[in-house]
């Protein structure tokens, strides 16, 4: 009966680790029991209160102390009025931060000079995310768009590889993958006269 949850849909972008206060204005009801909902689930946060602006106008706040990626989503507030649930326009919260790895290079065991591949993928927001590859402390490729595959033609000793993901918020380093040499049985036809590394860096869609 005349209940209004004020405010237009909002898109809010916040940096990871920063606080955010969402607010919700309710008019036409004394003492509303304001609930916050994220992606359909009620947000439990008992230290949240509401502010009376006037007897029939209240503002509810949802305080997030330090946002992380899992806080991103669609938020709205709701109140019950005469058995009916009224919901507000949503707030879309985007949490930006340094890239987050979805695929990191894995440890491998390969024969000497055998070719192999390592994969790396990272996401934002913000996008785009670019990848740089490292062998030990030497940069060996990039930057180029994520995801990426490093094609290595072979190694003759245990070697460490890692990737680095960059976006506008900064950079993140992946785990370090160790590529071990598989012991080759005596009498095998493996060639041992190559003593240098070859590596090729490529974006998956350009793989041959």
């Amino acid at each position: 009966a005349g209940l209004k949850l004020m405010g237009a849909p909002v898109k809010l972008t916040v940096s990871q680790g920063q606080p955010v206060k969402l607010n919700c204005s309710v008019e036409g009801m004394e003492e509303p029991d304001i609930q916050w909902v994220k992606d359909g689930a009620v947000v439990q946060n008992l230290d949240q209160l509401y502010i009376p602006v006037s007897e029939q106008h209240w503002i509810g706040f949802l305080s997030l102390k330090s946002v992380e990626r899992s806080d991103a989503g669609r938020y709205w507030c709701q109140v019950e009025d005469g058995g009916e649930t009224e919901i507000s326009q949503p707030v879309w919260l985007t949490v930006e931060g340094v890239p987050f790895f979805t695929v990191e290079p894995k440890d491998l065991a390969v024969p000497p000079n055998a070719p192999f591949q390592l994969s790396c993928e990272a996401v934002g927001p913000p996008e785009p995310v670019t990848i740089v590859w490292w062998r030990g402390t030497t940069k060996i490729g990039g930057p180029a768009p994520s995801p990426s595959v490093l094609n290595v033609t072979g190694v003759t000793q245990s070697t460490m590889f890692s990737c680095e993901a960059h976006n506008l918020k900064g950079l993140a380093s992946s785990r370090t993958a160790t590529v071990h040499l598989q012991l080759v049985p005596r009498g095998s036809s493996a060639h041992h006269h190559h003593h240098h590394h070859h590596s090729a860096w490529s974006h998956p869609q350009f793989e041959k």
């Epitope: 439990q44 008992l46 230290d47």
Partner: antibody
Framework: EVQLVQSGADVKKPGASLTISCQAS????????ISWVRQKPGKGLEWMGQ????????HYGPSFQGHVTISADRSTATAYLQWRSLEASDTAMYYC??????????????????WGPGTLVTVSS | SYELTQPPSVSVSPGQTARITCSGD??????AYWYQQKSGQAPVLVIY???KRISGIPERFSGSSSGTMATLTISGAQVEDEADYYC???????????FGGGTKLTVL
Amino acid sequence: EVQLVQSGADVKKPGASLTISCQASGYTFTDYWISWVRQKPGKGLEWMGQIRGPASATHYGPSFQGHVTISADRSTATAYLQWRSLEASDTAMYYCVRHQQQTSGGTIPEYYQHWGPGTLVTVSS
Amino acid sequence: SYELTQPPSVSVSPGQTARITCSGDALPKKYAYWYQQKSGQAPVLVIYEDKKRISGIPERFSGSSSGTMATLTISGAQVEDEADYYCYSTSTGGNYMVFGGGTKLTVL
């Protein structure tokens, strides 16, 4: 001036029931956001639970769930803490706490709390 | 159930800086509140949302939070600051509140 008036000290036997009260005055808005806090003699503070909003939504601390009931009467601006069966370990001071946020002209909330003077409950055979 | 851990006691001389810590797994995501309780009195809220000072509380009281640790700092502690101090925060799931065990501040 904001005031929380709590009921007087009480002495009960184990197994007895008891309800203590906390009446608020001096508020423009009866927003019923009240917590109860226990403090055993010489010990620290323990959050028991909270009642909030006109729907009287209640939340309890894990140690108090099922042992006490928190309620409120909007018409008299009074919150209640009730036991069905007291135990000797319930001997303590019980505080009610009124939570309030308000704005000073803008939309940035300031936070206030008002504590009642406490009700001493003694449970002894 | 969720716990907040405080040192049982802290002692400082008048004019020194007192630091009282509170640790809890949810503190990176949940705000800390600080209470002062003097002997025989009801507690008084001094700091809310980690670092905001309640109106009327002296400026020597400040709060901070980093990771799983919240800290109440009293810069230039005075004899009248001698009290028990409690931190308070929300449980990990946000569905109940918790007090720390309390720290007795002695200003010798």
